[in-house]
């Protein structure tokens, strides 16, 4: 069968029906990320509370993050939400402190329960706070006479970063 002439059009171009199916470059502020496209997509614009993390090119869309004081929510940073402090979570009534027994080590997201050391047969080496998880120590068996010395494990997770902890500081 006949090959579709449009299949020869590479990314960054579109198959222009108005010009005898010639491969035309995508117009400014548009892109095509795959070959054989009959139209180019409009570039995303990072405006308002969004800022440009990656510029649009003829072959890839722009990527946004959030301006200072805000962080991304949703796939592809579809929304920006105000930062809270570590030790808090955002509710409908604003940022609220984590309840006792929970923590949040980021400026975004929800408060999570402290690790239950006893479930792993371990003891609490360092108490938890609103901002930090507990640190579990060696199990009682490890502390029995003759047991080899044990280095306390590091916290289960490292403090996370919101987009603007990394950028623009």
């Amino acid at each position: 069968g006949l090959q579709d002439p449009c299949s020869n059009c590479p990314a960054g171009t579109f198959c222009d029906n108005n010009r005898n199916q010639i491969c035309s470059p995508c117009p400014p502020n548009s892109f095509s990320s795959a070959g054989g496209q009959r139209t180019c997509d409009i570039c995303r614009q990072c405006k308002g509370v969004f800022r440009t993390r990656k510029e649009c090119s003829s072959t890839s869309n722009a990527e946004c993050d959030c301006t200072p004081g805000f962080h991304c929510l949703g796939a592809g940073c579809s929304m920006c939400e105000q930062d809270c402090k570590q030790g808090q979570e955002l509710t409908k009534k604003g940022c609220k402190d984590c309840c006792f027994g929970t923590f949040n080590d980021q400026k975004r997201g929800i408060c999570r329960p402290w690790t239950n050391c006893s479930l792993d047969g371990k003891s609490v080496l360092v108490n938890g706070t609103k901002e930090r998880d507990v640190v579990c120590g060696p199990s009682p068996a490890d502390l029995s006479p003759g047991a080899s010395s044990v280095t306390p494990p590091a916290p289960a997770r490292e403090p996370g970063h919101s987009p603007q902890d990394i950028e623009g500081r």
Partner: antibody, heavy 118, light 107 residues
Framework: QVQLQESGPGLVKPSETLSITCTVS????????VHWVRQPPGKGLEWLGV???????DYNPSLKSRVTISKDTSKNQVSFKLSSLTAADTAIYYC????????????WGQGTLVTVSS | DIQMTQSPSSLSASVGDRVTVTCRAS??????VAWYQQKPGKAPKALIY???YRDSGVPSRFSGSGSGTDFTLTISSVQPEDLATYYC?????????FGGGTKLEIK
């Protein structure tokens, strides 16, 4: 309607600490951030810092070691403190609200003139 | 820090004139630029954010444009009440920085 009102001491001596209060109405500090900006007489604007709705703060590095911003949400007040004052800190000090749409200032207080002099 | 350089520092215009103020950022700030108007003896007032969006209640004769490093504030038909100093501000990264201001006088 949205209003912000600064109240300051007017005259402060060098090396002392400046303390200004911004009282807000028409919006909640639970939902909005508040910036502090100053303007020396006859000069331009300088951003000093911001306190966000959750209470986290960001400061201008040029002043960071001298500035403290805090708030009392129940009183609708934001507090600004600047330590180790010199004559160069003489300025009009403004508080301004940050909207939910960008990191900018949509409503401003009328400003309070602070003179640093012995 | 990102420097915001405004020009001209002052200009004089007649009522009905079209006036343009420019602002250049020392590095790419996308469209994260706001413009403020400060009338003599008053606090600044927000005019435009995101380079081109008018704040609520701002007359349509004020418009903004630009992206990257070059930005423009245009007053299509100057009115007597536009006597003021105009400032640009970038909010792409900390610290937030302002331009030096453009003082508009009315002939």
């Amino acid at each position: 309607q949205v209003q912000l009102q600064e109240s300051g001491p007017g005259l402060v001596k060098p090396s002392e600490t400046l303390s200004i209060t911004c009282t807000v109405s028409g919006f909640s500090l639970i939902s909005y951030g508040v910036h502090w900006v100053r303007q020396p007489p006859g000069k331009g604007l300088e951003w000093l810092g911001v306190i966000w709705s959750g209470g986290s703060t960001d400061y201008n590095p040029s002043l960071k070691s001298r500035v403290t911003i805090s708030k009392d949400t129940s009183k609708n007040q934001v507090s600004f403190k600047l330590s180790s004052l010199t004559a160069a800190d003489t300025a009009i000090y403004y508080c301004a609200r940050n909207p939910l749409t960008a990191t900018v200032m949509d409503y401003w207080g009328q400003g309070t003139l602070v003179t640093v002099s012995s | 820090d990102i420097q915001m350089t405004q020009s001209p520092s002052s200009l004089s215009a007649s009522v009905g004139d079209r006036v343009t103020v420019t602002c250049r950022a020392s590095q790419n700030v996308g469209t994260n630029v706001a413009w403020y108007q400060q009338k003599p003896g008053k606090a600044p007032k927000a005019l435009i954010y995101s380079a081109s969006y008018r704040d609520s209640g701002v007359p349509s004769r004020f418009s903004g444009s630009g992206s990257g490093t070059d930005f423009t504030l245009t007053i299509s038909s100057v009115q007597p009440e536009d006597l003021a100093t105009y400032y640009c501000q970038q909010y792409n990264s900390y610290p937030l920085t302002f331009g030096g201001g453009t003082k508009l006088e009315i002939k």
